[in-house]
Amino acid sequence: STTKCTVSHEVADCSHLKLTQVPDDLPTNITVLNLTHNQLRRLPAANFTRYSQLTSLDVGFNTISKLEPELCQKLPMLKVLNLQHNELSQLSDKTFAFCTNLTELHLMSNSIQKIKNNPFVKQKNLITLDLSHNGLSSTKLGTQVQLENLQELLLSNNKIQALKSEELDIFANSSLKKLELSSNQIKEFSPGCFHAIGRLFGLFLNNVQLGPSLTEKLCLELANTSIRNLSLSNSQLSTTSNTTFLGLKWTNLTMLDLSYNNLNVVGNDSFAWLPQLEYFFLEYNNIQHLFSHSLHGLFNVRYLNLKRSFTKQSISLASLPKIDDFSFQWLKCLEHLNMEDNDIPGIKSNMFTGLINLKYLSLSNSFTSLRTLTNETFVSLAHSPLHILNLTKNKISKIESDAFSWLGHLEVLDLGLNEIGQELTGQEWRGLENIFEIYLSYNKYLQLTRNSFALVPSLQRLMLRRVALKNVDSSPSPFQPLRNLTILDLSNNNIANINDDMLEGLEKLEILDLQHNNLARLWKHANPGGPIYFLKGLSHLHILNLESNGFDEIPVEVFKDLFELKIIDLGLNNLNTLPASVFNNQVSLKSLNLQKNLITSVEKKVFGPAFRNLTELDMRFNPFDCTCESIAWFVNWINETHTNIPELSSHYLCNTPPHYHGFPVRLFDTSSCKDSAPFE
């Protein structure tokens, strides 16, 4: 091909090539052609004769102002036609007359202000019609019943002001899953407008200034329709009462989106008419008081999003939003509750009472004063089968005994990013008989005891990053009870002292993060009592991160037991010489990181075993000694390996001898070196 199109598997991509005409030298068997972002003004039908197999044609983002009816005659198999972001203004009855197999027609962002006659009458197979971002002032798309298979009609960002039954009755035989009317200036829903449509399942009216009054009228018009999904995001619905959604009583609505409405008052029984509702989006509102009956009637809701729904109006404590006790008691089927980023004063004793199916609860950054978790804090969740609880970013400073004793089903507990500073007696976790993961990273300080985790032997993941960990060197180890642990993160704790039995018995451990500590002394031969082999017995360890620990020595047998190790990170240490057989048992190693150390020599006897099956190597920024003895074997290995070595040309530079300083390692000439073959 003379054009720079890329062709792969019968798909031709000719986008962004400043083309002014359709290429005439592409394979004739292509089924998908992408001509977007070019300078096409016309699509001459003759140019497509050779591409009769096309099922998808995308000519979006060009300057096409007219379409030849013969185009589809040349493309009898065409199913998807995308004309978005062009300059079409008129559609005649002939325009798409031959496009009888189309399932998708995209006309978004053109200049179509009016639809005359019946340009879509032949599209009996059309499923999606996108006319959004045009200048349409009405929903009139024809004068006779048509588009019987249409499922999605997208009319957002037009200038539609009223919905009229006489304009929508062309869809009398259609089942619309999605009628998208967002970002219009609709002020009127004429009687019967939605009944004119055969069946309407989804209606989207986001960014339409409805307000409470017009919302009420809309719902009355939706009565006795097939509506399932209704989206009214950012529709200036500032208050709701027990009449707002009355019309929906005669529907089976399952999804309602009221997000971004600055909703201030949710009156009692506002949603009493929605017993079938399953998904309810209320995020980004401004509810000042949730009354005990505000959510009454929502017996089938499974998902409720209240993120940033309760925000304080001013600095005054008196302006904090209120949630009455028992407000959620009606939500018997609720499984997922998101209450992130709110300004709720605290958790009352019956705040969550009645949520007998709740499995996921996010309370991240939800409270203004949740400093201490007591044995009463979560009493209202005692009868909830909660599996996941997120309590991050709440400035929690203390967890008292039995704080979670009500949550016997809990599997994941996230307490990260708080201000917890205390001795962990182990009583904090009492009752967590099914716990799988505890995330405690990014807190103030945690002092461990032998019983810190004695009551949670089921724990598989424990995250203790940057918590100023104290007493980690006690014996028996605080981690001794955690025989099911697979992930342990102890990074960023400035740990300097640990015992060789710190990880004893953790035979299932797969991931160990110890980066950013101060463990260098433990591996020094001069260490009193000799090096401390704290990794012994971890026969199932897959990932080991020891970055930034100041290591300048590695004992020869330190990785001896790590037969399944796949990834090891020893970057940002001070390693210079590694013992000969240090990696001998790492037969499964896939990734080795030794960047920013002081390695001068990469010899076969040290690195041969480690490099055997590597897929990724990072030894950037080491002061390589470019002599035969030091790197000849390495250079030959580099030039023959399939291992990925990022920035090999730029960041693997010789440091010595002086005449090689700054010279790329891979270009070192090994031809004069003896016995440097990388593979035997």
Epitope: R430, A454, P476, R483
Partner: antibody, heavy 119, light 107 residues
Framework: QVQLVQSGAEVKKPGASVKVSCKAS????????IHWVRQAPGQGLEWMGE????????NYNEKFKTRVTMTRDTSISTAYMELSRLRSDDTAVYYC????????????WGQGTLVTVSS | DIQMTQSPSSLSASVGDRVTITCRAS??????LAWYQQKPGKAPKRLIY???TLADGVPSRFSGSGSGTEFTLTISSLQPEDFATYYC?????????FGQGTKLEIK
Amino acid sequence: QVQLVQSGAEVKKPGASVKVSCKASGYTFTTYWIHWVRQAPGQGLEWMGEINPNNGRINYNEKFKTRVTMTRDTSISTAYMELSRLRSDDTAVYYCARVGVMITTFPYWGQGTLVTVSS
Amino acid sequence: DIQMTQSPSSLSASVGDRVTITCRASGNIHNYLAWYQQKPGKAPKRLIYNAKTLADGVPSRFSGSGSGTEFTLTISSLQPEDFATYYCQHFWSTPFTFGQGTKLEIK
């Protein structure tokens, strides 16, 4: 199943030493600490200390620290408790015990070894 | 060191009686308390751990309660095989001291 089998009864003279063994089976010996508890005739139970079979690290009850030595031989899955400078009030049944999955209890006990100190 | 004080030191009761034994710690041991039953010439047998968790194979007539410094072992309806000596033991910090024992005798 987990079993702790102790050595037989011993009679010792005051001032002598006694070494009681505890052979473990049914689990990996090096993964659980072994505790020693004694019981004088007609008296209560007294915790003496614990040993980590993996590295030999020990936590003693201060009361016995100067006289007791706890050791282990991992090759034969056996822990030992040696008590020196025996006195008549050291006459007792000496038990080894082991924690379970829950480390705050002793579900497993040896059958006990009676040590009699008599001149 | 934490001292454990058991009361009473001995107790006479009849089959079918409800019996309560108390154990007091000299410091806060949270719920790290175990109860054992011992019969003459035998090693102790674990009944309850973590103050209230019943060990496997132990009849449900045994129950434990308490937290902090005050703990109780209750036998709801004494059976002939329950006549023995009962000990509490804490597991908060070494040394893991035992109570002096409560001898439960047949009336």
